[in-house]
């Protein structure tokens, strides 16, 4: 796999161990936690990144109203099971044999069950809504400039094909970025919208996954854009299956967290 030959590092994933033991002495990088060889010319899958993160030492509106089936990742971090291609396995279980089904971005889409729980297929997240609030700025952002800059960012930094950035909405101070990618649209070699969204999420939290780069500096006509809060909604090709108890506000006692629907407060 391609990597920086001179010092043998992975430009797109700092959570790797690299050595010149590939074919012909080429640099090869493996993800921490899983040991899976990664392609350093593109983004690493979210599943492998989460696994690596868990293995690391612990130290009148133009805005979109999220669909009623939108999921928000409130469960936080877990150590996922990934398939040989680095995708999330449809069923995830923890050490106490509690299991649940996830979508292609690894977000829980069913109630938790036991080892008898069946997850027949990995359901694809085909629509991601990234909802940001930016910090007050000295100069206002022009919508079309902001749109162009965010599209450039996803194209250049995250290598996401422009056709998958469906829309950029702006109603100061809220910015919404809509990513859409159906199974049929995603060709071999295309970056997955879930992976691009995860890299972006880590960037705006000041936790860049890229090797050796400083934090993300995002400017619109020279004016820096600083993000105060981020909320990401995930929409699956097949709606999630949660019990009615959960949908009516139950099931979140005892300190457990759920992927609440959009009308819950976060």
């Amino acid at each position: 796999h391609t990597a920086a030959q001179d010092n043998c590092t992975c430009p797109t994933n700092k959570m790797t161990v690299c050595s010149p033991d590939g074919p012909g002495g080429r640099c090869q990088c493996r993800a921490l936690g899983s040991g899976v060889a990664v392609d350093c010319s593109t983004l690493t899958s979210k599943c492998l990144l989460l696994k690596a993160r868990m293995s690391a030492p612990k130290n009148a509106r133009t805005l979109v109203r999220p669909n009623e089936h939108a999921l928000v990742d409130n469960d936080g971090l877990y150590d996922p099971d990934c398939d040989p291609e680095g995708r999330f396995k449809a069923r995830q279980c923890n050490q106490t044999s509690v299991c649940w089904c996830v979508n292609s971005v690894g977000v829980r889409r069913t109630d938790k069950g036991d080892l008898s729980l069946r997850c027949d297929e990995l359901v694809r997240t085909h629509h991601i809504l990234i909802d940001l609030r930016h910090r007050p700025t000295a100069g206002a952002f022009n919508h079309s400039d902001l749109d162009a800059e965010l599209r450039r960012l996803f194209r250049e930094r995250y290598r996401l094909h422009p056709k998958f950035v469906a829309a950029v909405h702006y109603e100061q101070p809220t910015i919404q970025i809509e990513l859409r990618q159906n199974t049929s649209q995603k060709a071999a070699g295309d970056v997955d919208i879930g992976d691009a969204a995860y890299y972006f999420e880590r960037d705006v939290k000041g936790e860049s996954l890229f090797q050796g780069r400083g934090g993300l500096d995002l400017r619109v006509r020279g004016e820096p854009l600083q993000v105060e809060r981020t909320l990401i909604y995930y929409l699956d090709e097949i709606p999630p299956k949660f019990s009615m108890k959960r949908l009516t506000g139950g099931g979140s006692g005892g300190g457990s967290h759920h992927h609440h629907h959009h009308h819950h407060h976060h």
Partner: antibody
Framework: QVQLVQSGAEVKKPGASVKVSCKAS????????INWVRQRPGQGLEWMGW????????KYNEKFKGRVTMTVDTSTSTVYMELSSLRSEDTAVYYC???????????????WGQGTLVTVSS | EIVLTQSPATLSLSPGERATLSCSAS?????IYWYQRKPGQAPRLLIY???NLASGIPARFSGSGSGTDYTLTISSLEPEDFAVYYC?????????FGQGTKVEIK
């Protein structure tokens, strides 16, 4: 390390123009804006404007609009500040300073050039 | 424009003493930046985003505040801390600085 080096002192007559340069090194020149701030004798600091080398975007203090022009030469990593129609009250030390920022923080003006004294006298 | 008023204009203290410098904004700002200037030198950034210490700045410097009232504190003055201190806002254009507080040796 990041460094800004300014051109030398200038003496100008009222009505003339002055062009001060600021050469940057030690970082990716196009990645942050360069601001100009002046300090008149016995006075405080006064912001004049900034220029963003990546796309040439500029923001000027209205007080200096029409008199100040900021330009950039990316081939030499140099920014220029030209002030025209000089008057005696423009006598000041002129500083350039870079501002780094990320989506998380605005890191303020750091570092600053050593300053250029511009004296306007007939 | 946002006017920043610093107080006191002059602070006379001895080495080892605690210095508290105030910066009051004419309208609410989100963040304040603090700079130190010594005679014949360029200003130096001390604090960014109200409370974050700039690179290489000793931990005796700290910043706090919100809205219209901000503070720079030097917990124990060292001889090299005697200088003029300026606050600055980045909330609206034009960017403005306070008139400065001079910290002098008593």
């Amino acid at each position: 390390q990041v460094q800004l080096v300014q051109s030398g002192a200038e003496v100008k007559k009222p009505g003339a123009s002055v062009k001060v340069s600021c050469k940057a090194s030690g970082y990716t020149f196009t990645s942050s804006d360069i601001n100009w701030v002046r300090q008149r004798p016995g006075q405080g600091l006064e912001w004049m404007g900034w220029i963003y080398p990546r796309d040439g975007s500029k923001k000027y203090n209205e007080k200096f609009k029409g008199r100040v022009t900021m330009t950039v030469d990316t081939s030499t990593s140099t920014v220029y500040m030209e002030l025209s129609s000089l008057r005696s009250e423009d006598t000041a030390v002129y500083y350039c300073a870079t501002r780094f920022a990320t989506v998380v923080s605005n890191y303020g003006l750091d570092p600053w050039g050593q300053g250029t004294l511009v004296t306007v006298s007939s | 424009e946002i006017v920043l008023t610093q107080s006191p204009a002059t602070l006379s203290l001895s080495p080892g003493e605690r210095a508290t410098l105030s910066c009051s904004a004419s309208s609410s700002v989100n963040y304040i930046y603090w700079y130190q200037r010594k005679p014949g030198q360029a200003p130096r950034l001390l604090i960014y985003d109200t409370s974050n210490l700039a690179s290489g700045i000793p931990a005796r410097f700290s910043g706090s505040g919100s809205g219209t009232d901000y503070t720079l504190t030097i917990s124990s003055l060292e001889p090299e801390d005697f200088a003029v201190y300026y606050c600055q806002q980045w909330n609206s254009y034009p960017l403005t600085f306070g008139q400065g507080t001079k910290v002098e040796i008593k």
